[in-house]
Amino acid sequence: QLSLPSILPNENEKVVQLNSSFSLRCFGESEVSWQYPMSEEESSDVEIRNEENNSGLFVTVLEVSSASAAHTGLYTCYYNHTQTEENELEGRHIYIYVPDPDVAFVPLGMTDYLVIVEDDDSAIIPCRTTDPETPVTLHNSEGVVPASYDSRQGFNGTFTVGPYICEATVKGKKFQTIPFNVYALKATSELDLEMEALKTVYKSGETIVVTCAVFNNEVVDLQWTYPGEVKGKGITMLEEIKVPSIKLVYTLTVPEATVKDSGDYECAARQATREVKEMKKVTISVHEKGFIEIKPTFSQLEAVNLHEVKHFVVEVRAYPPPRISWLKNNLTLIENLTEITTDVEKIQEIRYRSKLKLIRAKEEDSGHYTIVAQNEDAVKSYTFELLTQVPSSILDLVDDHHGSTGGQTVRCTAEGTPLPDIEWMICKDIKKCNNETSWTILANNVSNIITEIHSRDRSTVEGRVTFAKVEETIAVRCLAKNLLGAENRELKLVAPTLRSELTVA
């Protein structure tokens, strides 16, 4: 598709001095044409010519040798081969004003003074000033008519039938147009029907209210079809609104609703004068009492990595509207003390979405979180456990000598979530411990060596390895690992006879 042509001067509007000359240049990717305010007969002083340039663009110039009030209007540059009459002219526009102290209003053809309004639509009374600064008022037989004015178009408003005159004052001189006559074309062949139900969900005992409005039509027959119709349960009302336009508002009220009043509520409007029918329908549901349903989008055990940002979303269906709150470990969540926020948004009439947001997960964010939704008829909650996952780290690696027996115990304390696994490795040739191949995993079933693990709390574990007798210097490695990471530390175990050599790596 071609991009829109461009105009020089590159302005939305321009004021041109009376009797001066002006030119407008249009540049396009294909052949361009100009649409301008005057008719062919009036445009003897408008010259259109094509211009050559080396940009590869098509250039068409519009030149006016002596500007007059009649040149005031919209100038549109467009691709002439793409336009069809039913489409709005698609192009680039500039509006030219040519102020003339003796011509306050742009001259019009006689047909422009006939303003036809269809179905009490808004209309434009096209009195346009030659000077954008000229104040204009609109008058009819009753005086000044309030309507919005745009010097490019005229007065825009909803006008009753009859004659209207535009009045302007230029340098103390008063100007009036000849009367514009507004005529109305009434009655459409369509029915404009709108249905409104402020609520579609109710509970027993409440009053159902549904309205149907017919616009711009006074001769209408409207019928209601609804579940309680046979019992004559509904009360129907008609309100006629005449200002600013005709509107017939039909209201159906069903008091003391029961579950049996659930179903389709339909209004059908028929034009009395024509075989034209329009129908609108809404589905209403009535519940015995209020309800709440909670639907989480996550499980009852959730994990979050340290420093991660995570959202927990819960869908809630409820009527009447619920109050939604969040608890942590059965205490109300105090948001301003933590990097945790919650919010609730209404998605549809009875659907809500609540979010718990962890901004930067910390270890202390672990715990039991509960969402509670309640209204006057029901309370529902959902609890899930959150674990902040922390990489393994070794807190301590120490040895413990068993006196003269020569036995030694090494204790390795590690933390992390999930709880780390502890693995032991041994290097028997102390000179070669820098080489990874010298290390072997310590199996549980080796005689004279006992390994054991104790959980200290939810995130700390202690592993122990006991050597019945250490006869030569060896190195022991503790390896703590979980899903998020691993850490290891080593220490030397020195035979009791070589005690003075003991070091911790």
Partner: antibody, heavy 118, light 107 residues
Framework: QVQLVESGGGVVQPGRSLRLSCAAS????????MHWVRQAPGKGLEWVAV????????YYADSVKGRFTISRDNSKNTLYLQMNSLRAEDTAVYYC???????????WGQGTLVTVSS | DIQMTQSPSSVSASVGDRVTITCRAS??????LAWYQQKAGKAPKLLIY???SLQSGVPSRFSGSGSGTDFTLTISSLQPEDFATYYC?????????FGQGTKVEIK
């Protein structure tokens, strides 16, 4: 992207009325003239009606003149076809269409089937 | 009203064939002519407008020519997806008459 979605089709008895709607999105609806085109089962395309971008003009095919009314609501981006005094020969898939390519129809709806039968 | 007449009403061809469809207007319409492709159960798709301008996204094997009263749609090398019905339409003034259609079938 440009989308036209027709609705309102169905089975109707001869002599009765039906109103078709065409919901537009993805383009400046109020700048385009809009058309209805129909296609009887196993037959070719037949142009039905046009309405100007600003509702200032309407034209109809001779076969529907006086019975069908085309209208539009630019505030709702919707085109309508009110079909009165329906006949068996009005049975067809009805498409709404429009476009900028020198009068050709760049975009079309998926169509809605109207069956006139007793 | 201006009548649009297409010929042939159907054509049998093989993949790779060159296919030509003609459309004649009962009065001159300059280059105000469009060509559409329609597959069973689908809406028509614009191929050519202004008699010879290729619509964006349409393969270059489709081309249009002509002016005044006689117009031609050519498919230079028929592909499996080209088996469909083709319509011409006048695009100036009203009614916007269509031709009766040409069905391109597998030989």
């Amino acid at each position: 992207q440009v989308q036209l979605v027709e609705s309102g089709g169905g089975v109707v008895q001869p002599g009765r009325s039906l109103r078709l709607s065409c919901a537009a999105s993805g383009f400046t609806f109020s700048s385009y003239g809009m058309h209805w085109v129909r296609q009887a089962p196993g037959k070719g395309l037949e142009w039905v009606a046009v309405i100007w971008y600003d509702r200032s003009n309407k034209y109809y095919a001779d076969s529907v003149k006086g019975r069908f009314t085309i209208s539009r609501d630019n505030s709702k981006n919707t085109l309508y076809l009110q079909m009165n005094s329906l006949r068996a020969e009005d049975t067809a898939v009805y498409y709404c269409a429009g476009g900028r390519s020198r009068g050709a129809f760049d975009f079309w709806g998926q169509g809605t089937l109207v069956t006139v039968s007793s | 009203d201006i009548q649009m007449t297409q010929s042939p009403s159907s054509v049998s061809a093989s993949v790779g064939d060159r296919v030509t469809i003609t459309c004649r207007a009962s009065q001159g319409i300059s280059s105000w002519l469009a060509w559409y492709q329609q597959k069973a159960g689908k809406a028509p798709k614009l191929l050519i407008y202004s008699a010879s301008s290729l619509q964006s996204g349409v393969p270059s094997r489709f081309s249009g020519s002509g002016s005044g009263t006689d117009f031609t749609l050519t498919i230079s090398s028929l592909q499996p997806e080209d088996f469909a019905t083709y319509y011409c339409q006048r695009t100036n003034s009203f009614p916007r008459t269509f031709g009766q259609g040409t069905k391109v079938e597998i030989k």
